[in-house]
């Protein structure tokens, strides 16, 4: 009996430019003889429904149809037919199929590969054209993929134990696509600093599929209106 197992859940997520290993494990009732077996990896793009050969291994012959693609013959002996793709790009996302032949048996498995890019975030103060005691803070998130992103603003006063999400005076612009396929977006918070308590911490919070925890940039209102603190990237309310 020949069986192939891919990543549990059927999806693998990898960061842009990473050296990704797409898992494929072979289970066979007898010890594997790699000289009499074949492995072929196929890729189907998200955008068009055509399967392309990425890599093949047959006996003493192996060929990479995608530069740098490799299956380790040494690991193959112990049933690991995982495909390594160095420097993965956004356009290489899609369905990967691992096909194993141990004559006369054949088995296959598929996995979806998602390529993500993490946003970079920075906080800017724009006082141009603003009234006295009024400030506009801009939170720029750039270089992220996929397009779906959630940007919120939070504030925490000195006295209360938890932050609160700000919903008024927040405008988040449209996402803009970059030449490399990643996206940028800017969210703006308008503040009347005369109505806020000194010591209040404001924070731009970015949530994205590529991030395990949200990305935060903060500033603290001081008696002298505001300070975009040096620690604006310390991800910290304290």
């Amino acid at each position: 009996d020949l069986k192939v197992e891919m990543m549990a859940g059927g999806t693998q997520i990898t960061p842009l430019n990473d050296n990704v290993t797409i898992f494929c494990n072979i289970f066979y009732s007898q010890p594997l003889n790699i000289t009499s077996m074949g492995i072929t990896w196929f890729w189907k793009s998200l955008t068009f429904d055509k399967e392309v050969k990425v890599f093949e291994f047959f006996g003493d012959h192996q060929e990479a149809f995608r530069p740098g693609a490799i299956v380790s013959p040494w690991r193959l002996k112990s049933g690991d037919a995982s495909l390594r793709l160095p420097g993965i790009q956004l356009e290489e996302a899609g369905e990967y199929r691992c096909e194993v032949v141990v004559t006369p048996l054949k088995a296959q498995g598929t996995v979806q590969l998602e390529v993500v890019a993490s946003p970079a975030s920075r906080l800017l103060l724009d006082q141009v054209g603003m009234k006295e005691n009024e400030d506009k803070y801009m939170c720029e998130s750039s270089g992220f993929y996929p397009e779906a992103i959630n940007i919120t603003w939070e504030k925490q006063t000195q006295k209360f134990p938890h932050p609160i999400e700000i919903s008024e005076d927040v405008i988040t612009g449209p996402t803009i696509k970059n030449m490399d396929g990643t996206f940028n977006v800017t969210s703006c918070l308008k503040l009347n600093s005369s109505q806020e308590d000194p010591g209040t911490v404001y924070q731009c919070v970015v949530r994205h599929a590529s991030l395990h925890t949200p990305l935060r940039s903060n500033f603290t209102l001081t008696a002298a209106r505001h300070s975009l603190s040096e620690t604006e990237k310390t991800d910290n309310f304290s």
């Epitope: 925490q156 006295k159 209360f160 134990p161 938890h162 925890t213 935060r216 991800d235 309310f237």
Partner: antibody, heavy 117, light 107 residues
Framework: QVQLVQSGAEVKKPGASVKVSCKAS????????MNWMRQAPGQGLEWMGG????????DYNEKFKGRVTMTVDTSTSTVYMELSSLRSEDTAVYYC??????????WGQGTLVTVSS | DIQMTQSPSSLSASVGDRVTITCKAS??????VAWYQQKPGKAPKSLIY???NRYDAVPSRFSGSGSGTDFTLTISSLQPEDFTTYYC?????????FGAGTKLEIK
């Protein structure tokens, strides 16, 4: 990292007073407001009051007004909560707490005060 | 003072179950609600703030929802370590007030 270390357990007689301390470390002490909570055995949580750590502002729960006093010693980064005219129903674990960061608010380990004759 | 009425006071469930705890405020508190988990002999630990935002390092199986007067904490798939007590708290105004707690027990 931020740490709030409280004084040890106390046993008091009814009518006496107790003073619980909370020593803070790992952050700029005076920039914060410190709250005090208590929890009677097997019961829920109750806010007692709070103090701004620069020492110029307090806010007490009406229920405890006249019996509770919160003070600060900035030289040792320590906050104190004193409760007077103790009665058996004041038997509880007392906690100092500070507003948090993105992992949540900070709590001391708690101080058990037992009021018993 | 704002009263926070939490229900149920106790709840029996099994590992893997989905459970919901509710909290009702006596007046509009917007989204100024937090949820805590407290294990026996330990200080409470924050899970949720602003009604629906998870604190970092809190597992994604915990989620909060609601605004105004009605709030819920949902645990999507109970793990053995989740069987303990949960409290809601309003922080729109002083005095800060808590719900009476919900004790989650293994069925």
């Amino acid at each position: 990292q931020v740490q709030l270390v409280q004084s040890g357990a106390e046993v008091k007689k009814p009518g006496a007073s107790v003073k619980v301390s909370c020593k803070a470390s790992g952050y700029t002490f005076t920039n914060y407001w410190m709250n005090w909570m208590r929890q009677a055995p097997g019961q829920g949580l109750e806010w007692m009051g709070g103090i701004y750590l620069s020492g110029d502002s307090t806010d007490y729960n009406e229920k405890f007004k006249g019996r509770v006093t919160m003070t600060v010693d900035t030289s040792t980064s320590t906050v104190y909560m004193e409760l007077s005219s103790l009665r058996s129903e004041d038997t509880a674990v007392y906690y100092c707490t500070r507003r948090g960061d993105y992992f949540g608010d900070f709590w001391g380990q708690g101080t058990l005060v037992t009021v018993s004759s | 003072d704002i009263q926070m009425t939490q229900s149920p006071s106790s709840l029996s469930a099994s590992v893997g179950d989905r459970v919901t705890i509710t909290c009702k405020a006596s007046q509009n508190v917007g989204k100024y609600v937090a949820w805590y988990q407290q294990k026996p002999g330990k200080a409470p630990k924050s899970l949720i703030y602003s009604a629906s935002n998870r604190y970092d390092a809190v597992p994604s199986r915990f989620s909060g929802s609601g605004s105004g007067t009605d709030f819920t904490l949902t645990i999507s798939s109970l793990q053995p370590e989740d069987f303990t007590t949960y409290y809601c708290q309003q922080y729109i105004s002083y005095p800060l007030t808590f719900g009476a707690g919900t004790k989650l027990e293994i069925k």
